[in-house]
């Protein structure tokens, strides 16, 4: 019962986490215009992974997609890749874990197969969560670096030289959604891995096996005969998977009182 609960809870937590990762990836508020200590503007800028937006105090919002791949910063491309890898792994993990759920009967699937699938999905959720957390953290680091660079520019006496207002960006809502979602997916994955241990049959004891001799009837009761569990030579079923280290080579602006009425 506890195993089923752990597995079910792990699935639900991971599902919420992956939904959050998808939401964060699609959100436009990865970075938002810093309003603190800035002249109060009637225009608010915010940016996502796929487009940048401007919301005017009039209520008019205009968003423009990044219609170039080559012209984008490598870091942004890396964040995009990490988030997409996280979503893909998470989605596959969800698919696998549905079939692995103990409460769902599919044909004559053995518990051992379900244990395998539970561990697979658990590992996928863990990697998915780590990808999301890494992606969001890389973006946050990029923001912090740019923030202090733009702050330095504001105070280096370049006033008259600069033709645009130095817009500083700070953490947007998507970052917090991404961190929380990544954490949930990670926790869900760990729970699935824990559930896997309970699902895997340790041993089967044949307490009484009757042997009928041709002559007289003798009941033979061996002490603890261990039968094979269907995992080939792996009778103890201690290690179904090795960790499966993965290498991912492809991974490389209503309002507040200031934002306009």
């Amino acid at each position: 019962m506890a195993v089923t609960a752990c597995q079910g809870l792990g699935f639900v937590v991971s599902l919420i986490g992956i939904a959050g990762i998808i939401a964060a990836t699609c959100m436009d508020q990865w970075s938002t215009q810093d309003l603190y200590n800035n002249p109060v503007t009637a225009v608010f800028n915010y940016q996502g992974l796929w487009r940048s937006c401007v919301r005017e105090s009039s209520g008019f919002t205009e968003c423009r997609g990044y219609f170039t791949l080559l012209g984008l910063p490598a870091m942004l491309q890396a964040v995009r890749a990490l988030m997409i890898v996280g979503i893909v792994l998470g989605a596959i993990g969800l698919l696998v874990s549905i079939f692995a759920l103990k409460c769902i009967r599919i044909g004559s699937m053995e518990d051992s197969a379900k244990a395998n699938m539970t561990l697979t999905s658990g590992i996928m959720f863990i990697v998915s969560g780590l990808c999301a957390i890494a992606g969001v953290s890389v973006f946050a680091n990029m923001l912090v670096t740019n923030f202090w660079m733009s702050t330095a520019n504001m105070y280096t006496g370049m006033g008259g030289m600069v033709q645009t207002v130095q817009t500083r960006y700070t953490f947007g809502a998507a970052l917090f959604v991404g961190w929380v979602a990544g954490g949930l997916t990670l926790i869900g994955g760990v729970m699935m891995c824990i559930a896997c241990r309970g699902l895997a049959p340790e041993e089967t004891n044949y307490k009484a096996v009757s042997y009928h001799a041709s002559g007289h009837s003798v009941a033979y009761k061996p002490g603890g005969f261990k039968a094979s569990t269907g995992f080939g030579s792996n009778t103890k079923n201690k290690k179904i998977y090795d960790g499966g280290a993965r290498t991912e080579d492809e991974v490389q602006s209503y309002p507040s009182k200031h934002d306009y009425v």
Epitope: V40, N45, C53, Q163
Partner: antibody
Framework: QVQLVQSGAEVKKPGSSVKVSCKPS????????IDWVRQAPGQGLEWMGG????????VYNEKFQGRVTLTADKSSMTAYMELSSLRSEDTAVYYC???????????WGQGTLVTVSS | DIVMTQSPDSLAVSLGERATINCKSS????????????LTWYQQKPGQPPKLLIY???TRESGVPDRFSGSGSGKDFTLTISSLQAEDVAVYYC?????????FGGGTKVEIK
């Protein structure tokens, strides 16, 4: 078509208050901000503040902070501007205007002349 | 506050001739987010409220004749009337729509020579 109809002219004593109304029509009242701009006789335009009729959020020109109060009544679909502690230099034509894209004002009321005189 | 300085204060131009009004802002009105300049031009005739001519420094409001055009970026802006008509006699104002408080220029009076 979009129209903003303002209340009639007012004559006030120094130290008193005036409340000017602005009733827009031809569009959804809560969808656009209403700004207030004044123009002293023979002078230029001066922005006083703006209100979001949907949320009631306001932004004011600090020059008028404390003296001006902008409100909006959704039921009567009317915006109001109240200016207190009137002085002779507050004598002006007061306009309400609808804020649109570019934060520009595309439709204006006909203006309300407020005369402050003892 | 952002100071908007218009020049000249008044301008006399012959009918059919070009009229040019300048507006200078004390700070850049160019928003880096959408590369738009938050400057608006209005026309005000005696006894009337102002009329919106141009927003985003160069976008003509619908119904405004194409002889009116806006240009400039950052701090320096220009309103041009390519061929002055009698009905264009008015006072023209520029407005900062980027920083609060939203401020207007002092106005430029356009007359017929």
């Amino acid at each position: 078509q979009v129209q903003l109809v303002q209340s009639g002219a007012e004559v006030k004593k120094p130290g008193s208050s005036v409340k000017v109304s602005c009733k827009p029509s031809g569009y959804t009242f809560t969808n656009y901000l209403i700004d207030w701009v004044r123009q002293a006789p023979g002078q230029g335009l001066e922005w006083m503040g703006g209100i979001n009729p949907g949320s009631g959020d306001t932004v004011y020109n600090e020059k008028f902070q404390g003296r001006v109060t902008l409100t909006a009544d959704k039921s009567s679909m009317t915006a109001y501007m109240e200016l207190s502690s009137l002085r002779s230099e507050d004598t002006a034509v007061y306009y309400c205007a609808r804020r649109v894209r570019g934060n520009s004002f595309d439709s204006w009321g006909q203006g309300t002349l407020v005369t402050v005189s003892s | 506050d952002i100071v908007m300085t218009q020049s000249p204060d008044s301008l006399a131009v012959s009918l059919g001739e070009r009229a040019t009004i300048n507006c200078k802002s004390s700070q850049s009105l160019l928003n880096s987010g959408n590369q738009k300049n938050y400057l608006t031009w209005y026309q005000q005739k005696p006894g009337q409220p102002p009329k919106l001519l141009i927003y985003w420094a160069s976008t003509r409001e619908s119904g405004v004749p194409d002889r009116f055009s806006g240009s400039g970026s950052g701090k320096d802006f220009t309103l041009t009337i390519s061929s002055l008509q009698a009905e264009d006699v008015a006072v023209y104002y520029c407005q900062n729509n980027y920083f609060y408080p939203l401020t207007f220029g002092g106005g430029t009076k356009v007359e017929i020579k």
